[in-house]
Interface confidence: medium
């Protein structure tokens, strides 16, 4: 911490500019204004502060702010954003999705790091849901943020926002998360006719029920082998061989190269040898 | 994931100059300060200088400041670092890098060669 | 400038062996940042705040210190840990580095 000490004549600070990177730490602390600090952020990414100035900045906005940075400030914050400590972040009340964007290109290109799982957690808390637009900036910046979160929190996902979800989104979540998210999509893309709403509801199988598989395979949708393998394997194992061979469509020949896998194995193991003949694939039950 | 691209290689003369370019992705180019770093052959890491591509400010190294030039093309998102008055002090290999708190990238550096 | 001195220049260590390394600075700095370099590679960076972990970096790897005096410490070597390692101040410019410890494996 430094010490408090008065500023020397003629030093004290009229405006953030690079003048003060000459300054010495105690020099900064007695003879920067912090209100005009919070009010000229945005000028000071653009100056090279030593990483020993900024924490003395990042000091006097705690020090001006002990309940927690203004949005105005936090919007202009740039890469000193990652100076800032979760515990810092969790005084914060972050409303504006322009805020939230601002703060997510600093830590673009790069893994989540604990500030921004703090960030994006108190937003979303703030605004009650996981609105589309919020979903849609989060997933933008990171393809995995929804597989990320647990069913609990995924429940407070409406429906509407499901279509800002890219197949991308879904690559790492798992049953659980797909039983929470499955049914949202369903209920978001109903008004679809068949061949449109399978390529929207596709992504999403891994949540899907029995009943839906077998509506699906009266609906000529040739479901691709990558799919099939994600589905629930006691969503699979009541099919019969007849609707596996509907639901594939030309795809059914693929399964071969799939038996020893779940769930394809789990399902050959229910069928009677005579229905799996019928395949015409050497599947043995 | 964020990269910086550099080209491998340069051989110029003595006496002359070079321009060498990191093509930055990834990330929003304007947000960070871009550095350059020399290393002689068998030697340590020097700092030469940094520039800021969204305000153009630049910070030098003292020892660097009459022989680099930085600058930037935002719309190219692309550093640039000037070599003037090549000597065969000056061969060595050139890195651009972001170097912040808890994370770095560097490219992977222009080896220069001074040779007549 | 800062300069900032390493000790050793060389060393060598043994698979499971600790190995810590110095960084000394000739006035007080608030943190250090410790890099790590293989032939032909770029550096990378492995601590930085003095003792926190970048993103990747094993866990056998720790960095203490305050003031003028840094250290670096693997707590059992590996093979993959032969390189060039250099600490690095950003407490005043221009920003400096040592001039590295060269750690080989015996």
């Known amino acids: 911490e430094v010490e408090k000490t008065a500023c020397p004549s003629g030093k004290k600070a009229p405006e953030i500019d690079e003048s003060l990177i000459f300054y010495k730490k105690w020099e900064l602390e007695a003879c920067v204004d912090a209100a005009l600090l919070a009010t000229q952020m945005d000028r000071v990414n653009a100056i090279p502060f030593t990483y020993e100035q900024l924490d003395v900045l990042k000091h006097k906005l705690d020090e001006l702010y002990p309940q927690g940075y203004p949005e105005s400030v936090i919007q202009h914050l740039g890469y000193l954003f990652l100076k800032m400590s979760p515990e810092d972040i969790r005084k914060w009340n972050v409303t504006s999705l322009e805020t939230l964007k601002a703060l997510l290109e600093v830590n673009k290109g790069h893994e989540m790091s604990p500030q921004v799982a703090t960030l994006i957690d108190r937003f979303v808390k703030g605004r009650g849901q996981l609105d589309k637009d919020t979903l849609d900036t989060l997933t933008a910046f990171y393809p995995g943020y929804l597989c990320s979160l647990s069913p609990e929190e995924l429940s407070s996902v409406p429906p509407s926002s499901i279509w800002a979800v890219r197949p991308q989104d879904l690559d790492t979540c798992d049953p659980r998360q797909l039983d929470v998210l499955y049914p949202k999509a369903r209920l978001a893309f109903q008004n679809m006719n068949g061949s449109e709403y399978f390529v929207k509801i596709q992504s999403f199988l891994g949540g899907a029920p029995t009943e839906d598989l077998k509506a699906l395979s009266q609906q000529n949708v040739s479901m691709d082998l990558a799919t099939f393998m994600k589905l629930r394997t006691d969503a699979v194992l009541p099919l019969t061989v007849a609707e596996v061979q509907k639901l594939l469509g030309p795809h059914v020949e693929g399964l071969k190269a799939e038996e020893r896998h779940r769930p394809v194995r789990d399902w050959i193991l229910r069928q009677r040898q005579d229905d799996l003949d019928t395949l015409g694939l050497g599947l043995q039950g | 994931q964020v990269q910086l691209q550099q080209p491998g290689a340069e051989l110029v003369k003595p006496g002359a100059s070079v321009k060498l370019s990191c093509k930055a992705s990834?990330?929003?180019?304007?947000?960070?300060?871009m550095h350059w770093v020399k290393q002689r052959p068998g030697q340590g890491l020097e700092w030469i200088g940094m520039?800021?591509?969204?305000?153009?400010?630049?910070n030098y190294n003292e020892k660097f400041k009459s022989k680099a030039t930085l600058t930037v093309d935002k719309s190219s998102s692309t550093a640039y670092m000037q070599l003037s008055s090549l000597t065969s002090e000056d061969s060595a290999v050139y890195y651009c890098?972001?170097?912040?708190?808890?994370?770095?990238?560097w490219g992977t550096g222009t080896t220069v060669t001074v040779s007549s | 400038q800062i300069v900032l001195t390493q000790s050793p220049a060389i060393m060598s260590a043994s698979p499971g062996e600790k190995v810590t390394m110095t960084c000394s600075a000739s006035s007080s700095v608030s943190y250090m940042y410790w890099y790590q370099q293989k032939p032909g590679s770029s550096p990378r960076l492995l601590i930085y705040d003095t003792s926190n972990l970048a993103s990747g970096v094993p866990v056998r790897f720790s960095g203490s210190g305050s003031g003028t005096s840094y250290s670096l410490t693997i707590s059992r070597m590996e093979a993959e840990d032969a390189a060039t390692y250099y600490c690095?101040?950003?407490?005043?410019?221009?920003?400096?580095f040592g001039a590295g410890t060269k750690l080989e494996l015996k």
């Open positions: 990834g990330y929003t180019f304007t947000i960070y300060w």
């Open positions: 890098s972001l170097i912040h708190w808890y994370f770095d990238v």
């Open positions: 520039i800021h591509p969204n305000s153009g400010n630049t």
């Open positions: 690095q101040q950003w407490s005043s410019y221009p920003l400096t």
